[in-house]
Interface confidence: low
Amino acid sequence: DPVLCFTQYEESSGKCKGLLGGGVSVEDCCLNTAFAYQKRSGGLCQPCRSPRWSLWSTWAPCSVTCSEGSQLRYRRCVGWNGQCSGKVAPGTLEWQLQACEDQQCCPEMGGWSGWGPWEPCSVTCSKGTRTRRRACNHPAPKCGGHCPGQAQESEACDTQQVCPTHGAWATWGPWTPCSASCHGGPHEPKETRSRKCSAPEPSQKPPGKPCPGLAYEQRRCTGLPPCPVAGGWGPWGPVSPCPVTCGLGQTMEQRTCNHPVPQHGGPFCAGDATRTHICNTAVPCPVDGEWDSWGEWSPCIRRNMKSISCQEIPGQQSRGRTCRGRKFDGHRCAGQQQDIRHCYSIQHCPLKGSWSEWSTWGLCMPPCGPNPTRARQRLCTPLLPKYPPTVSMVEGQGEKNVTFWGRPLPRCEELQGQKLVVEEKRPCLHVPACKDPEEEEL
C-alpha cells in the first residue's frame, strides 16, 4: 500500500518531520534508513531504520484521586523490516503498570456547631447590618473535607441615631498666574489653586469630620521657556607636550566654556579658550652639512710622466670640496667629496690667438666715489688645439670627455699698441648719491 514518506524521524516525540510526499511504497521510502513513513495522515510514524523499542512514555494519571490506585505507561516497537528484542513486530505496544497514590486518604464531610451571638451593628448611626458565625467542628471534616452551607449569616439593623454630615471639598478654583516667566532660574516657577470645604460643610450637631487634605495645592509651571544660562570657563587643561624635539617650541593649554555651557541664549564665556607658553627642549637642533664650493682643479698630469703640457696626451686632474657646518647629528652631505676629469694640459703653452669682440660694458667704478667710469675690453683669446674631445682611457669603460686645462700664452697681432688686452673707458652719467635705505625711512 502507498504511504506518506518523510525525511526525518524525531526520536523524542516519535513524530515524522519533513514531508517528502505520498503515493510511494514503504520499500521505496525506506531505501534511505534516515527516512520515516505514515500509513495515513496523522497515523503512527514509523522510522525506516531497523526496529527498536521507543523510550517509555510518561506515566498516565493515577486511576483514583485518593487512596491507592494504579497507573500505566507504554513503549512501542518502532522501525521497519525486522523485529524488536523479544521477537516483537513493529507497531506493537508493551505496557507497564505500577501502584500509585496521589493522596493517602479520601475527604470526609464535617458538621456545624450552633450559631454564635450577633455582632454589633456595622454602623453607629442610621441603618446597617449585623453578622453571626458558626464553626465547622461538629465533627471536624477529615482529609481535606468541608461542611455544607455557609459559616456566617447577616441581617439588617437600625441604630435609631442621626448621622453627622462629614465635610467634602468643593471643586478646585482656577490656577493663579505663574510666579516666574522662565524655568531654570534661581526660583522654580509655581502656580497655585485653592478649594473650599463646602460640598457639604461638616455638620455641627452631631459634629461631622472636617475635609481631609489641604485646601490649596501648588505645581511647577509648564510650557515656560528656559531661562538663559551664561557660559562659564572650565579649568585649564593639561599643557600640551612640547611639539618639537629640539630648540624652542610652543605649548598650549585649553579650557572649555562648559562650566556651565551657555544655554537658551545666555552669553558665551568672556576671554580666551587657549593660552600658549614657550617650551625649551634644551636640545640643539641638528644642522645638516653643506658642501663648500669646489676647490681648484689640481694640475693636469699623467702618472709616470713628468709633464704632458702642450702635447696631445690626455691626463687626469681632481678637485675636492669639504662638508661643513654639520652639527648635532644632522645629515652628512650627499654626493661625492672628490671630482675627477680627463684633461689636456695647455699650461704656459704658446698658442696662436685672435682678438675677441668687445665685451659688454662693466659696472661703474667706484660706485660711491668721485667720477665713476665703466670699461669694456677686447682680449687676445687662444685658439685651442684640435685634440680629440673624447678619449677611451680604459678598455671597456667607454669614451670620456677631455677638457683643456691651464693658462696658455696666446699670441695676437698688436692692436692699438697692445698684445693681450685692449680697454676702453667712459664716464658714468647722472650718478645718484649712495644713501642707507634704513636711514632714508627715518
Epitope: 654639520r326 645629515h331 652628512r332 652631505c333 650627499a334 654626493g335
Partner: antibody, heavy 108, light 107 residues
Framework: KPSQSLSLTCSVT?????????WNWIRQFPGNKLEWMGY???????KYNPSLKNRISITRDTSKNRFFLKLNSVTTEDTATYYC?????????????WGQGTLVTVSA | DIVLTQSPASQSASLGESVTITCLAS??????LAWYQQKPGKSPQLLIY???SLADGVPSRFSGSGSGTKFSFKISSLQAEDFVSYYC?????????FGGGTKLEIK
C-alpha cells in the same frame, strides 16, 4: 646574571678623548652580527641606538682618558663580545681604531 | 633604521681568484659606506672608507665601488690571509648599522 648591570671601561692612549674623535661601543653577538650601541663625543654629547631604549649609558673620565659603558637589566640576549672604537667623526667618520674586545656572558 | 643586506653570506674560492661581495642599502646613503675585515678572535679592521677610498696600509688588491644604494667590494687576487669575514657599514644616519657579514672560505 640576568637583571644585573654590565659595566665596561675603554682606556685610550696616544690621543685625548676631548679632541675631535667620537668614542663608540659596538657589540658582536654569537652569530657574528655587529650592532652599534652608541657614542660619547669629544665634548661629552651622547647618541644611543634606540633599540637599547633607556638601558644604556656611556660616560667618560677625562682625567684618566677613558670612557665607560653601562647596560642595565641585562638578559641572556645581551651575551656578546663588546668592542670600543674611535672615529674622527667630523673629518672622517670611519671606525679606524678598535679595542681588542671583551666577551660578556649573561647566564643564571 | 637603514638596513644593509650583504651577499653572499659565505663564499668558497681558490687562491689567486677574484671575489666580489655586494651590499644593498634600504635607502640612499650617498658614499657613506665602509668595509671591514675581521680575522677570527680579532676586532674588525677598516679596509675601505667613503665607498671607494683605500684606508692607510691596506693592499691595493682590495677595492670598493658604488654609491646611493648599491655597493661592491672586490678582492682581485686572493691570498691565504684573505679567507676571513668581511662586513659593510653605513654612517649616513644614526643608528649606524652593519651588514650581516660574508665569510670567505678556501676551496
Amino acid at each position: 646574571k640576568p637583571s644585573q648591570s654590565l659595566s665596561l671601561t675603554c682606556s685610550v692612549t696616544g690621543y685625548s678623548i676631548t679632541s675631535t674623535y667620537y668614542w663608540n661601543w659596538i657589540r658582536q653577538f654569537p652569530g657574528n652580527k655587529l650592532e652599534w650601541m652608541g657614542y660619547i663625543s669629544y665634548d661629552g654629547t651622547n647618541k644611543y641606538n634606540p633599540s637599547l631604549k633607556n638601558r644604556i649609558s656611556i660616560t667618560r673620565d677625562t682625567s684618566k682618558n677613558r670612557f665607560f659603558l653601562k647596560l642595565n637589566s641585562v638578559t641572556t640576549e645581551d651575551t656578546a663580545t663588546y668592542y670600543c672604537a674611535g672615529d674622527d667623526y667630523d673629518r672622517s667618520p670611519w671606525f679606524a681604531y678598535w679595542g681588542q674586545g671583551t666577551l660578556v656572558t649573561v647566564s643564571a | 633604521d637603514i638596513v644593509l643586506t650583504q651577499s653572499p653570506a659565505s663564499q668558497s674560492a681558490s687562491l689567486g681568484e677574484s671575489v666580489t661581495i655586494t651590499c644593498l642599502a634600504s635607502q640612499t646613503i650617498g658614499t657613506w659606506l665602509a668595509w671591514y675585515q675581521q680575522k677570527p678572535g680579532k676586532s674588525p679592521q677598516l679596509l675601505i672608507y667613503a665607498a671607494t677610498s683605500l684606508a692607510d696600509g691596506v693592499p691595493s688588491r682590495f677595492s670598493g665601488s658604488g654609491s646611493g644604494t648599491k655597493f661592491s667590494f672586490k678582492i682581485s687576487s686572493l691570498q691565504a690571509e684573505d679567507f676571513v669575514s668581511y662586513y659593510c657599514q653605513q654612517l649616513y644616519s644614526t643608528p649606524w648599522t652593519f651588514g650581516g657579514g660574508t665569510k670567505l672560505e678556501i676551496k
